[in-house]
């Protein structure tokens, strides 16, 4: 009975025309969910002439359905058992889900001072941004609608530049309409253990962001892996919008509606500073903000994002060290709401629920020639906005899941 | 002391252009502030033409200007110009360049040509 | 673009005695808790000189008897005692939006 089960299990998820795994795979049967709190600050003005802590106060959620397109490109190599793909993005705003509306205003950060002060560090080149901050009226924080936040908007300060340059500004920018990718991972055709585990990403097998084996590109995209799951398991995942791969640990068991799954989490050592986890120092860039590399739970992944001083973090600064979150005030991390976990079905190895959660985070620094981070007197590590990424088996795929997976084996 | 120098006064026919420049004494602060160009007409108030951040040569004009005049600069002599094209005689006016303060780049002039006057009779 | 208006368009203020200069925006020039208002004296046959900037900062080595209020729309030069040399045209100037607009000015006189 075992094996033949296994043998099923096998046949049914590779990633091949007719299987349920491929189906499931090139569009995903679960609704997924982007929730986004931003941080709006309180005290602009102290913070900016008299470098006081910041004041956030988070708003939110806000809610968009996402994840909601099927792969494109999607193309079989039988010759080395993979099949290559691209992940459109989309979002749709979900009002109903959300505490108001795309509209709403928020005091954040100024994503252009602050990225601009960061890349241009010439004195000289810095007096000529302070003209263009000043002329253009902006400031070092800005009022901004959460779609402008979110999706883009035309920066009055970057427009002042006669060359051409991306005026265009906004967290997630550019989004609705691109593509994440091209992945090529195994089909698992040849080799059931290494069904969905990436191959290359964007052609490459590295990343370019990262020294040694930080660089690597590991592991699957957490949506599933592959199947018979030990709790024992290091599960390794490759998430693009960390750029990095990370991993996650066996925590505890938990039935999703009557489907017994293995809740796997990020461990607070993922984010742990080379100090405490040795294999982390290859994730330490510079030694100024990360205290000669004894800062942890932050990712300075500027060399992703075309040198913009973005840092990744945990929601509310969960697992980071105190200097992180010291200049900030309003934060209150925990993890039953700011980690991450995946419900795996270890049998199939997919992933039939999970929350993704991250901060996104802006570093500002003061500068004598700008005029408007001069009386700054040290560093923020400035959090935006945390978002909370959800998805779970709906009730009719758990009933089909019941009988035909988890039923025959029990 | 001058600070800005103003080219000399300028009497020219209808449908002509004309070119006026104002020499910055201060080489420091020329490249990194931001050069106004304003006019005054007799009796009139004042109109904003436009200005430039002459180091990377980014440029406002009055939406009134854009067609009518052109603004450069060289960093090299420390000199504004700006070029007046089919002029008329409602271009008649003095002419001033101003300097943003010291380079903060707010819209408010500390430091004034002594103006040019440009005459087109009509 | 934004229109200002000066009033009164002239004034004559006996020697030693307070001038006040109102400029009226129409729409606020305010932005990021400051007001992109400035003053200028005019005399003849002189280009304008920097009196007060965002609205209330006196320039550098001009008397104290100058000073600058307001803000949004609303903004006053006050001339406080005035002196002889203090015959001239005044104009106010805002600097929140291009084009940069100056108001018709106001002359002052000695009475």
């Known amino acids: 009975g075992d094996l033949l089960i296994q043998k099923t299990i096998k046949k049914q998820v590779v990633l091949e025309e007719g299987t349920i795994a491929f189906k499931n795979w090139v569009k995903t049967g679960t609704e997924v969910y982007r929730q986004f709190w931003i941080f709006d600050v309180q005290n602009p003005q102290e913070v900016m002439m008299n470098s006081s802590n910041i004041q956030v106060k988070q708003r939110g959620p806000y809610t968009y359905r996402v994840r909601f397109l099927a792969k494109e490109n999607v193309t079989q190599d039988a010759e080395d058992n993979t099949v290559s793909f691209l992940q459109p993005n989309g979002a749709i705003f979900e009002p109903s889900l959300s505490v108001g509306t795309e509209a709403d205003n928020f005091t954040v950060l100024n994503l252009a001072v602050a990225a601009a002060s960061h890349i241009y560090q010439n004195q000289f080149v810095q007096m000529i941004l302070n003209s263009l901050i000043n002329k253009s009226k902006s400031s070092m924080f800005q009022v901004r609608t959460l779609r402008e936040l979110l999706w883009g908007y035309r920066d009055p300060f970057l427009s002042l530049v006669p060359y051409p340059v991306t005026t265009t500004v906004g967290l997630f920018y550019p989004y609705n309409n691109t593509a994440d990718g091209v992945y090529k991972v195994f089909n698992g055709k040849d080799n059931i253990s290494k069904v969905a585990i990436i191959d290359t990403y964007k052609g490459k097998r590295n990343l370019s962001y990262w020294e040694s084996h930080c660089d690597m590109i590991n592991g699957t995209d957490a949506a599933s892996f592959p199947p018979f799951v030990e709790k024992s398991q290091v599960l390794q995942f490759f998430s693009s919008d960390i750029c990095r791969s990370i991993y996650a640990v066996f925590e505890s068991d938990v039935n999703l509606k009557g489907i017994p799954v293995y809740r796997f989490v990020l461990p607070s050592k993922a984010f742990a500073s080379p100090v405490e986890n040795p294999d982390n120092y290859c994730f330490c860039t510079e030694k100024i903000i990360s205290k000669n590399c004894t800062s942890y739970g932050v990712l300075d992944i500027s060399k992703c994002k075309e040198g913009r001083p973005v840092y990744i973090s945990l929601p509310h600064f969960l697992y980071a060290s105190p200097d992180v979150s010291e200049p900030i005030d309003g934060l209150n991390p925990n993890e039953e709401e700011h980690r991450t976990y995946l419900d795996i079905e270890p049998i199939t190895g997919f992933t039939l629920q999970f929350a993704k959660r991250l901060q996104v985070n802006l570093l500002v620094k003061p500068s004598e020639k700008i005029q408007v981070l001069k009386n700054l007197k040290r560093n923020y590590i400035v959090p935006i906005l945390w978002l909370n990424e959800t998805g779970t088996i709906g009730d009719e795929k758990a009933n089909m899941f019941r009988s035909q997976v988890t039923g025959k084996i029990n | 002391q001058v600070q800005l120098q103003q080219s000399g006064s300028e009497l020219r026919s209808p449908g002509s252009s004309v070119k006026l420049s104002c020499k910055d004494f201060d080489s420091e602060v020329f490249p990194i502030a931001y050069m106004s160009w304003v006019r005054q007409k007799p009796g009139h108030g004042f109109e904003w033409i436009g200005d430039?951040?002459?180091?990377?040569?980014?440029?406002i004009y009055g939406e009134k200007f854009e067609d009518k005049a052109t603004l450069d600069a060289d960093t090299v002599s420390n000199t504004a110009y700006l070029e007046l094209n089919s002029l008329t005689s409602e271009d008649s006016a003095i002419y001033y360049c101003?300097?943003?303060?010291?380079?903060?780049?707010?819209?408010?002039?500390?430091?004034w040509g002594a103006g040019t006057t440009v005459t087109v009779p009509s | 673009d934004i229109v200002l208006t000066q009033s009164p368009a002239s004034l004559a203020v006996s020697l030693g005695q307070r001038a006040t200069i109102s400029c009226r925006a129409s729409?606020?020039?305010?932005?990021?808790?400051?007001?992109?208002m400035h003053w200028y004296q005019q005399k003849p046959g002189q280009p304008p000189k920097l009196l007060i900037y965002r609205a209330s900062n006196l320039e550098s080595g001009i008397p104290a008897r100058f000073s600058g209020s307001g803000s949004r729309t609303d903004f006053t030069l006050t001339i406080n005692p005035v002196e002889a040399d203090d015959v001239a045209t005044y104009y106010c100037?805002?600097?929140?939006?291009?084009?940069?607009?100056f108001g018709g000015g106001t002359k002052l006189e000695i009475k």
């Open positions: 100037q805002q600097s929140n939006e291009d084009p940069y607009t």
């Open positions: 430039i951040l002459p180091s990377i040569g980014s440029t």
């Open positions: 729409e606020s020039v305010d932005s990021y808790g400051n007001s992109f």
């Open positions: 101003a300097r943003d303060y010291y380079g903060s780049s707010y819209g408010y002039f500390d430091v």
